[in-house]
């Protein structure tokens, strides 16, 4: 039961990308608005995009304080114009999210080669280390710092000459790989978290190849 | 449960093409890697490749110079290879196993490919 | 390519033995490395990742140790079921090479 021509949300899903994380929610509102509350399973409830008419919110502040933690969500509905109005049973209408454990469910964003410097028959690829919302310190950290060697790149490398790829993994952000001489390669990696079993792959990175403003050859 | 579930076996005549498929269940599908892995009889194993079903790319043992072709069904999450221009040296069993990046955890039961004139 | 020298070839040992096998890599994988153990006519069965991690449900008088170049697997104690082909596979760059397989037998 709810106030008169209130209608409770529903859809309610987490969108996250590198903890960047977001609750969005339907339908778009007539004649009502909406607060959403987040909390961990033992914590209090944490009222955040107060009365408003989007249909999603940033809850990205909250998450990253504890970013292995399990958070719900709920989004209230409320009478445009008479937020103080609540339904027969003396509450709002609300609906509960599903429940979201960043650190197991936030997806991989799309990993970036920062680098790659040839020195005779040996190319070192680097991968950049992207920054996270999450702090500790009151610094940011980046990707690796929050998961360790549980995050791996997986890169995938091939001739500019033909299309074979081999590919080789690293629990850091370098790769040094053998290369033939005389021979431009193309580059392109995936952020991995194995210990996971969904959401466990980003996207590939763009690729990059050798011969392009990249790289760094050095002949030894 | 989390099962590969292959094809069964095959009698094939020397050039001729076989077609032996995977079926995973129990898991997301397009999370892991499909690797194949075959073994001659009496042999050790021998790893031919793998296919990516999130995007699709593959990679093979150069050294097999073209012998398999790795694709994948994500709808039926099934995963195939296809052996061509068969001799008698690919009589093996060949098993497709899941990819967990640092081991291969879960394989199928293996098809047995007989190349015999 | 990475080649994988796997030793013994076979051995033979008794129930209550304690055995080592060893894998030697070509060129530095880290940690990369897996064991799997396989019985006659069926799949092979993943036994350690990442050179020492022991995978779920398997017992524990399993063990891998060592980085780099250099790995060992060692069963404490052989159990009758424990008579089967073991294999190395480093997954560290393609392609995925395994050893050539040692095969404890009984004694």
């Known amino acids: 039961s709810g106030t008169t021509n209130t209608v409770a949300a529903y859809n309610l899903t987490w969108k996250s990308t590198n903890f960047k994380t977001i609750l969005e929610w339907e339908p778009k509102p007539v004649n009502q608005v909406y607060t959403v509350q987040i909390s961990t399973k033992s914590g209090d409830w944490k009222s955040k995009c107060f009365y408003t008419t989007d249909t999603e919110c940033d809850l990205t502040d909250e998450i990253v304080k504890d970013v292995k933690q399990t958070y719900l969500a709920r989004v209230f509905s409320y009478p445009a114009g008479n937020v103080e109005s609540t339904g027969s049973a003396g509450e709002p209408l609300y609906e509960n999210s599903p429940e979201f454990t960043p650190y197991l469910e936030t997806n991989l964003g799309q990993p970036t080669i920062q680098s790659f410097e040839q020195v005779g028959t040996k190319v070192n690829v680097t991968v950049e280390d992207e920054r996270t919302l999450v702090r500790r310190n009151n610094t940011f950290l980046s990707l690796r710092d929050v998961f360790g060697k549980d995050l791996i790149y997986t890169l995938y490398y091939w001739k500019s000459s033909s299309s074979g790829k081999k590919t080789a993994k690293t629990n850091t952000n370098e790769f040094l790989i053998d290369v033939d001489k005389g021979e431009n390669y193309c580059f392109s990696v995936q952020a991995v978290i194995p210990s996971r079993t969904v959401n466990r792959k980003s996207t590939d990175s763009p690729v990059e190849c050798m011969g392009q403003e990249k790289g760094e050859f050095r002949e030894i | 449960q989390i099962q590969l579930v292959q094809s069964g076996g095959e009698v094939k005549k020397p050039g001729a093409s076989v077609r032996v498929s995977c079926k995973a269940s129990g898991y997301s599908f397009t999370d892991y890697n499909v690797y194949w892995v075959r073994q001659s009889p009496g042999k050790g194993l021998e790893w031919i490749g793998y296919?990516?079903?999130?995007?699709?790319?593959?990679i093979y043992d150069q050294n097999l110079k073209g012998k398999a072709t790795l694709t994948v069904d994500k709808s039926t999450s099934t995963a195939y290879m296809e052996l061509s221009s068969l001799r008698s040296e690919d009589t093996a069993v060949y098993f497709c196993a899941r990819d967990v990046t640092t081991a291969l955890d879960f394989w199928g039961q293996g098809t047995t490919v007989t190349v015999s004139s | 390519d990475i080649q994988m020298t796997q030793s013994p070839a076979s051995l033979s040992a008794s129930v209550g033995d304690r055995v080592t096998i060893t894998c030697l890599a070509s060129q530095t994988i880290d940690t990369w490395l897996a064991w799997y153990l396989q019985k006659p006519g069926k799949s092979p069965q993943l036994l350690i990742y990442?050179?020492?991690n022991l995978a779920d449900g398997v017992p524990s008088r399993f063990s891998g140790s060592g980085s780099g170049t250099d790995f060992s697997f060692t069963i404490s104690s052989l159990q009758p079921e424990d008579f089967a082909t073991y294999y190395c596979q480093q997954v560290y760059s393609s392609p995925f090479t395994f050893g050539q397989g040692t095969k404890l037998e009984i004694k």
């Open positions: 990442a050179a020492t």
């Open positions: 296919i990516d079903p999130y995007n699709g790319i593959t």
